[in-house]
Interface confidence: low
């Protein structure tokens, strides 16, 4: 083996005999034929050595200590490395020790990476043998903060004046990272702060400093608990002792956000608070002890985090402070009223003002809770306006139409999320580009996704519904002439899982005169069904829509109309359809109120289908359904 320590490393390595075992044969460290039972390597030294036995891990342990001086110069903050790397060390039980000395005014924070730490008490050990021992300092006195295993909730420990951190790794453990970093903080004005983060349900057992011995006299120690919003925390004291106080009183103080009586002070013998919503702090405050008969203050307690027993205790924060022109309404789903008694279902603002429905507006954070036996009785509708007032500023600007993640945190199903897209009249138009190509919902090929986009005109005088579209089709973009509303409507709770498939980008583009243009790139595997807007009610009077249909170079598109005739009867004007080859610009014009629709026809190149309506007689509307299929091109007919 070779261990080389850089001169400036402030690292010392010590190999020494471990706990004596009743092994018959002794073992030695061999350095240049000389046998020894202890080896110390200091900065700047490079030592070559071997062991005289096959299993040195049964005899020796190795300690690697790094002294970090924050008194005389800058402190090397950041992720703490295992130096030397474990791969360069002999396979012995090893303890890495970091001894950090700092001014009283400087706070030091140990940050532990996931899986975080779990404190254990006397007589316990860690399943994998990896342990952390953490100590602090009060003047010259060392104070044990605790010993910890992996897989817990302790994410950070803040101290001041100094930290001694020991990481014990068994010889067989492959670990090559320390799992923590050091950061500097302002003075914490107490012995230490331990942060415990819960990701979900679970419990943590924690102990006062020096446990099971006595907590330092007149000291203050704080635990900060980070609890997910939907869970509740309860504290119970497993074991405690009180010292004999001369002045002041030993107590625990809770800082509970939202409480009007912070800090809430409890005696150790009191019943401790339970069912707490949100993050909270717990502090242990010692007293001035009787010099003759001090006794000891010690505390071992458990924090249990679990789902609340009923929904009414949960507080949800809906942060609309960064949203503009947005309103969120939580309201009852429409259901058939039964004659039976139905318990009330209310949504509450700030836990106090409760009603059957609630509208939250953008610009602020809202705290809400529910008093409801079954939250599936409610749903949520959101409206957001995206408007452009200055066409010079908006042109080519894009917005992402996505449901904000905050909304998924609420326990109520999203029904509709509507974006109203408003443009200056006759100045700009809109284009919708989906993250995944869209399919138009038709009777022949219905959407079977957990959500769809409903696209409709948002001009009050205009009754124009472009259709319902879901991911997984062939429509690459939808261009619309003027104001529209795009509504993401959910149909199943699985929308939360499928939410990653949502995503539309809207861009403001130069104004064009057609009511809508659909850009379609058919899939070689399936029929693309397309139908005119306002299906079943008829395309509005004098409205023109187009489909830009791309045909891949090696394919032939077959365009088929559902009926022989449209059935439209024009009161004034003419209804016509133009089919135009994009490459040659050759076009055919069909009179929809007179001619039969064309028979299935083949297109070797991309083409346009444009439909323009007349003013139809009532009841004789223009509705057109067609489909496009692709087949491989066998003979090039061009």
């Amino acid at each position: 083996f070779e261990i080389a320590l850089p001169r400036e490393s402030n690292i010392t390595v010590l190999i020494k005999l471990g706990t004596p075992t009743l092994l018959a044969k002794p073992c030695y460290i061999v350095i240049s034929k000389r046998h020894t039972t202890m080896l110390s390597i200091k900065p700047g030294e490079r030592i070559l050595f071997t062991f005289s036995c096959q299993s040195p891990e049964n005899h020796f342990v190795i300690e690697i200590q790094k002294n970090i001086d924050c008194m005389s110069g800058p402190c090397p903050f950041g992720e703490v490395q295992l130096q030397p790397s474990t791969s360069l060390l002999p396979t012995l039980n090893r303890t890495f020790i970091w001894d950090v000395k700092a001014h009283k005014s400087i706070g030091l924070e140990l940050q532990f990476s996931i899986p975080r730490l779990r404190q254990f008490g006397p007589g316990e050990s860690c399943p994998d043998g990896v342990t952390y021992s953490i100590s602090g300092r009060i003047d010259a006195t060392v104070v044990r903060i605790g010993t910890f295993c992996s897989n817990g909730t302790v994410s950070r420990i803040k101290m001041q004046e100094g930290v001694k951190m020991a990481l014990h790794l068994p010889w067989f453990h492959p670990r090559n990272v320390s799992g923590f970093s050091i950061a500097n903080r302002s003075s914490i004005k107490r012995l230490c702060i331990i942060e415990s983060v819960f990701e979900g349900e679970g419990s943590a057992t924690l102990m006062s400093a020096n446990y099971p011995e006595g907590f330092p006299e007149d000291e203050l120690m704080t635990w900060q608990f980070v609890i997910p919003a939907h869970l509740r925390a309860s504290v119970s004291f497993l074991n405690f002792n009180l010292s004999n106080c001369e002045r002041k009183e030993e107590r625990v103080e809770y800082y509970i956000p939202g409480s009007t009586t912070n800090p809430e002070v409890f005696k150790l013998e009191d019943k401790q608070p339970g069912n707490m919503a949100g993050n909270f702090n717990l502090s242990l405050q010692g007293c001035d002890q009787d010099a003759q008969n001090p006794g000891i203050l010690r505390l071992q307690f458990q924090v249990l985090v679990q789902h609340p027993q009923n929904e009414s205790n949960k507080i949800y924060v809906v942060d609309l402070s960064n949203e503009r022109a947005t309103s969120l309404t939580i309201e009852p789903r429409p259901v058939k009223q039964s004659r039976k008694f139905v318990p009330g279902c209310f949504v509450c603002l700030e836990s106090r003002t409760c009603s059957t429905n609630l509208t939250l507006t953008s610009g602020s954070k809202h705290k809400i809770s529910f008093l409801c036996d079954n939250l599936t009785r409610l749903w949520m509708n959101v409206e957001k306006n995206i408007s452009c007032t200055d066409h010079r500023y908006c042109q080519r600007k894009s917005y992402s139409l996505q449901v904000p993640s905050d909304i998924f945190h609420l326990p109520v199903e999203l029904h509709d999320f509507s974006w109203k897209l408003l443009v200056p009249k006759d100045r700009l138009s809109l284009v919708l580009v989906p993250a995944q190509k869209l399919q138009q919902h038709t009777h022949e090929k219905p959407c079977n996704t957990s959500f769809s986009y409903l696209v409709a005109s948002a001009i009050p005088s205009q009754d124009l519904y472009f259709g319902s579209f879901c991911p997984g089709g062939s429509i690459e973009q939808i261009q619309v002439k003027q104001n529209i509303s795009v509504t993401l409507r959910t149909f199943a709770p699985s929308f939360r899982q499928e939410a990653s498939r949502q995503g539309l980008t809207v861009s403001f583009i130069p104004y064009f005169k057609e009511e809508g243009v659909f850009t379609v790139t058919p899939d070689t595997k399936s029929k693309v069904y397309l139908r005119t807007p306002n299906w079943d009610r008829g395309l509005p009077s004098l409205t023109s829509v187009s489909w830009n249909i791309s045909v891949p170079r090696d394919q032939v598109a077959c365009l088929t109309f559902f009926k022989e005739r449209t059935g439209v009867v024009c009161q004034t004007g003419r209804a016509f359809m133009i089919i135009q080859e994009q490459r040659t610009r050759a076009e055919e014009i069909f009179s929809l109120d007179e001619d039969a629709l064309p028979k299935p026809r083949f297109h070797h190149h991309s083409f346009w289908v444009n439909i323009s309506n007349c003013s139809p007689a009532s009841g004789k509307q223009l509705d057109l359904l067609f489909w496009v299929t692709l087949t491989p091109r066998t003979v090039d007919l061009t």
């Epitope: 080519r396 600007k397 894009s398 580009v433 993250a435 995944q436 690459e476 973009q477 990653s500 498939r501 980008t505 861009s507």
Partner: antibody
């Protein structure tokens, strides 16, 4: 048909500058993030920089930060890479790539590349 | 940055035989969405790279079904069920989870 065509490569001395261009066609350019990826002669691929649809967000590999600038002109369907303070180790074929697909970073279309040689 | 490691670096294969390339990442590429953010690219001689597989196991359009991707977390495999002469080139894996995206060193597939 999606097409990306790079240009602007050539021989330049260390410390010099070049501006690469990428002309895009066959897709809605303004709807996609775009990237530059390079490949040193006989070596593997290294991502260099990318830019959001509207140009509001840009990111660079550490080795080119402060020296290279990515930009785009959606009206011209063009992507650019301004390379200053060039070093010998910047010698590579530079590819313009479209970031498509649900994983964001997936480069679903690539240009044919343009060779940049930095040599004295 | 996430480090990607491919093996083997060179892979001579007889046409019609299967081939397998391994890729390991220095940290898990499994996203909360359940996808593995790993792509495979092929760079044929004298050509630019082309996307073969995205999100670990999804074939890009136009990619023959003899190509398949598998694996999860940190270990991934690209398999070619029956190698054809046109499959020669350098295969790269790339993590698409974090910026910057990082590529493996490449595996050169050649015909025996």
């Amino acid at each position: 048909e999606v097409q990306l065509v790079e240009s602007g490569g050539g021989l330049v001395q260390p410390g010099g500058s070049l501006r690469l261009s990428c002309a895009a066609s066959g897709f809605t350019f303004s709807s996609y993030w775009m990237s530059w990826v390079r490949q040193a002669p006989g070596k593997g691929l290294e991502w260099v920089a990318n830019i959001k649809q509207d140009g509001s967000e840009k990111d660079y590999v550490d080795s080119v930060k402060g020296r290279f600038t990515i930009s785009r002109d959606n009206a011209k369907n063009s992507l650019y890479l301004q390379m200053n303070s060039l070093r010998v180790e910047d010698t590579a074929v530079y590819y313009c790539a479209r970031e498509g697909g649900s994983s964001g970073w997936t480069f679903d279309y690539w240009g044919q590349g343009t060779l940049v040689t930095v040599s004295s | 940055d996430i480090v990607m490691t491919q093996s083997p670096l060179s892979l001579p294969v007889t046409p019609g035989e299967p081939a397998s390339i391994s890729c390991r990442s220095s940290q898990s590429l499994l996203h909360s969405s359940g996808h593995n953010f790993l792509d495979w690219y092929l760079q044929k001689p004298g050509q630019s790279p082309q996307l073969l597989i995205y999100l670990g196991s999804n074939r890009a359009s136009g990619v023959p079904d003899r190509f398949s991707g598998s694996g999860s977390g940190t270990d991934f495999t690209l398999k070619i069920s029956r190698v054809e002469a046109e499959d020669v080139g350098v295969y790269y894996c790339m993590q698409a989870l974090q910026t910057p995206p990082t590529f493996g060193q490449g595996t050169k597939l050649e015909i025996k």
